[in-house]
């Protein structure tokens, strides 16, 4: 015998209290698949979260973060404070990158400058707190007397800011 609940489409639930008829999901709830016996409560985007997509009867709300914060975790389960380029977030707040490291985004960690010699290349543009070095040709490719290092390009916002 076919389960009568299998006929209930997304946006409804199979209501045991009403002889297993398909009832619409109540306000602030949803069912994203058919044949559900309950509707799920919609996620609420509060505080540092803001609504990216409203809840509907067939899909959950989606949150992102208010300006100055960025998403972390699956489905933006957490919001983390932004820092400036050239900084990283520590337990004590935003701290400048140490010499030899950089961060070209408002999130994430300071990473070591690329080791150009790893690829047999020279440093074409010096690194800064906000920018990685740019590796150039191998030292053998440089013409005699040519300067191998260019001063770093000035870092500007937004730089490699997360979208």
């Amino acid at each position: 015998l076919q389960d009568p609940c299998s006929n209930c489409p997304a946006g409804t639930f199979c209501d045991n209290n009403r002889n297993q008829i398909c009832s619409p999901c109540p306000p602030n709830s949803f069912s994203s698949a058919g044949g559900q016996r309950t509707c799920d409560i919609c996620r609420q985007c509060k505080g540092v979260f803001r609504t990216r997509k409203e809840c509907s009867s067939t899909s959950n709300a989606e949150c992102d973060c208010t300006p100055g914060f960025h998403c972390l975790g699956a489905g933006c389960s957490m919001c983390e404070q932004d820092c400036k380029q050239g900084q990283e977030l520590t337990k004590k707040g935003c701290k400048d990158c140490c010499f030899g490291t950089f961060n070209d985004q408002k999130r994430g960690i300071c990473r070591p400058w690329t080791n150009c010699s790893l690829d047999g290349k020279s440093v074409l543009v010096n690194g800064t707190k906000e920018r990685d070095v740019v590796c150039g040709p191998s030292p053998a490719d440089l013409s005699p007397g040519a300067s191998s290092v260019t001063p770093p390009a000035p870092a500007r916002e937004p730089g490699h800011s997360p979208q």
Epitope: C116, L118, V134, A153, H160
Partner: antibody
Framework: QVQLVQSGAEVKKPGASVKVSCKAS????????INWVKQAPGQGLEWIGN????????NYNQKFKDKATITADKSTSTAYMELSSLRSEDTAVYYC????????????WGQGTTVTVSS | DIQMTQSPSSLSASVGDRVTITCRPS??????LNWYQQKPDKTVKLLIY???RLRSGVPSRFSGSGSGTDFTFTISSLQPEDIATYFC?????????FGQGTKLEIK
């Protein structure tokens, strides 16, 4: 020598998912970003996102945030891109690329993987 | 996102001709501008990085110049093997973006 070898062509039905692989060799996999780039038929190039295999840190183009998931397996020097809820507009050649020296240009490209979405 | 306006979209030139392609980002990208060649078989190759730096192994007939919001790619003497589509790309700001490409044909 540096090589990026991608998995073969895929044909998928709308709504399905596909996972494209990119096996790197000839360099230290964990020291360079791997990027993914889309080229739809007759179109230009679109950056999807990238991953730093050392710690699996990722960046995504907002346009592809709900479409693509980029991962990396350090033990096999392989990067992956999974595309979900496929639609006809996802039909394209997908390239993996490596950054050049620092994360601002792409010096090596895979041969491309054609993904066709058709019912 | 930074828009990259590349022109022309296609051009036809003779062997030995000087060929110039321009790329104009919608905002200042310093020198973080790269040029790629895509051959008819779909293989892609980096030719020039950081505006004017020739990638090792790339023939010296290819060159690049410019800064900020105005960049130029030049082939000083076109060769038959240069038949390809050429793309510019900015590496200054995420998401990285490409020009729409210039399809180069031999007359």
């Amino acid at each position: 020598q540096v090589q990026l070898v991608q998995s073969g062509a895929e044909v998928k039905k709308p709504g399905a998912s596909v996972k494209v692989s990119c096996k790197a060799s000839g360099y230290t996999f964990t020291s360079y970003w791997i990027n993914w780039v889309k080229q739809a038929p007759g179109q230009g190039l679109e950056w999807i996102g990238n991953i730093y295999p050392s710690d699996s840190y990722t960046n995504y183009n907002q346009k592809f945030k709900d479409k693509a998931t980029i991962t990396a397996d350090k033990s096999t020097s392989t990067a992956y891109m999974e595309l979900s809820s496929l639609r006809s507009e996802d039909t394209a050649v997908y390239y993996c690329t490596r950054d050049y020296g620092s994360s601002y240009s792409f010096d090596y490209w895979g041969q491309g993987t054609t993904v066709t979405v058709s019912s | 996102d930074i828009q990259m306006t590349q022109s022309p979209s296609s051009l036809s030139a003779s062997v030995g001709d000087r060929v110039t392609i321009t790329c104009r980002p919608s905002q200042d990208i310093s020198n973080y501008l790269n040029w790629y060649q895509q051959k008819p078989d779909k293989t892609v190759k980096l030719l020039i990085y950081y505006t004017s730096r020739l990638r090792s192994g790339v023939p010296s007939r290819f060159s690049g110049s410019g800064s900020g919001t105005d960049f130029t790619f030049t082939i000083s003497s076109l060769q038959p093997e240069d038949i390809a589509t050429y793309f510019c790309q900015q590496g200054d700001t995420l998401p990285y973006t490409f020009g729409q490409g210039t399809k180069l044909e031999i007359k």
